[in-house]
Interface confidence: medium
């Protein structure tokens, strides 16, 4: 069965720093989302080989990509306190598959010592349930419009 390996499980960074999240799969996917979980889960990026990636407006100019959709590293720059949260990779396949999640803790520089990651992965209860019987993602309320690519980037 298709799986998504995601790392790190957790990372603590000061305001203004960057973080790398890596999503690896065994291939055979159409594209990959990075979603920020919460009461209103929000898509942060969508990446597909051969197409200019799209990024949510809140992260405009703060995201870089390296690798391919099968082994993708997403770099989030200039992190803000409001970026704290759990981010999960979602591979779009015939049945959508989720990574284990990355907890990103953004702290004020002087309080770094108070907030540390444990070695345990994010709790499974924080992850969305995979869709049942459908390859479509669950509907959600988007809180911001994306920053779409130039029209010439379409396949």
């Amino acid at each position: 069965a298709q799986e998504v390996q995601q790392s790190p499980h957790c990372t603590t960074v000061p305001v203004g720093a960057s973080v790398n999240i890596t999503c690896s799969t065994s291939g055979g996917l159409r594209g990959i989302y990075l979603r920020q979980l919460g009461p209103q889960p929000q898509d942060i990026i969508y990446y597909e080989d051969g197409v200019v990636p799209t990024t949510d407006r809140r992260f405009r100019g703060r995201i870089d990509f390296s690798g391919s959709q099968d082994n993708l590293t997403i770099t989030m720059h200039r992190l803000q306190l409001s970026d704290t949260g759990t981010y999960t990779c979602q591979a779009i396949t015939e049945v959508n598959v989720y990574g284990s999640g990355t907890l990103v803790l953004v702290t004020e520089e002087q309080s770094q010592g108070w907030h540390r990651c444990s070695d345990a992965p994010p709790r499974a209860s924080a992850l969305p349930a995979p869709p049942t019987g459908s390859a479509l993602p669950d509907p959600q309320t988007a809180s911001a419009l994306p920053d779409p690519p130039a029209a010439s980037a379409l396949p």
Partner: nanobody, 124 residues
Framework: QVQLQESGGGLVQAGGSLRLSCAAS????????MGWFRQTPGKEREFVAA????????YYADSVKGRFTISRDNTKNTMYLQMNSLKPEDTAVYYC?????????????????WGQGTQVTVSS
């Protein structure tokens, strides 16, 4: 329940024009991505154009750029596809779609709701 209803399809000569309409009902579409796709027998649905309802930002497939124009009328909750300089290869069933994800606007899996489709036939 969201409902999308296309209209405006038909038979037209190459070089002619058609305007498709998609009437949306069942909720407020202000935060939605709306799109047009087309499909010919034995092939997957192909992205044609998309519009973000709030911002009005529009995106087109290379094959229709400069010939097709997507727009929407907020007061009527209706989306349009103006198709000019039609070619025989534009012959297909055209579907309108609506979704809330939006980052993969050229992909069918970003759309939650679909119309029944309207046939467009371009004769040479």
């Amino acid at each position: 329940q969201v409902q999308l209803q296309e209209s405006g399809g038909g038979l037209v000569q190459a070089g002619g024009s058609l305007r498709l309409s998609c009437a949306a009902s069942g909720r407020t579409f202000s935060d939605y991505l709306m799109g047009w796709f087309r499909q010919t027998p034995g092939k997957e649905r192909e992205f044609v154009a998309a519009i973000y309802w709030n911002a009005g930002s529009t995106y087109y497939a290379d094959s229709v750029k400069g010939r097709f124009t997507i727009s929407r009328d907020n007061t009527k909750n209706t989306m349009y596809l103006q198709m000019n300089s039609l070619k025989p290869e534009d012959t297909a069933v055209y579907y309108c779609a609506a979704g809330q994800r939006g980052l993969a606007y050229a992909r069918t899996y970003d759309y939650d709701y679909w119309g029944q489709g309207t046939q467009v036939t371009v004769s040479s």
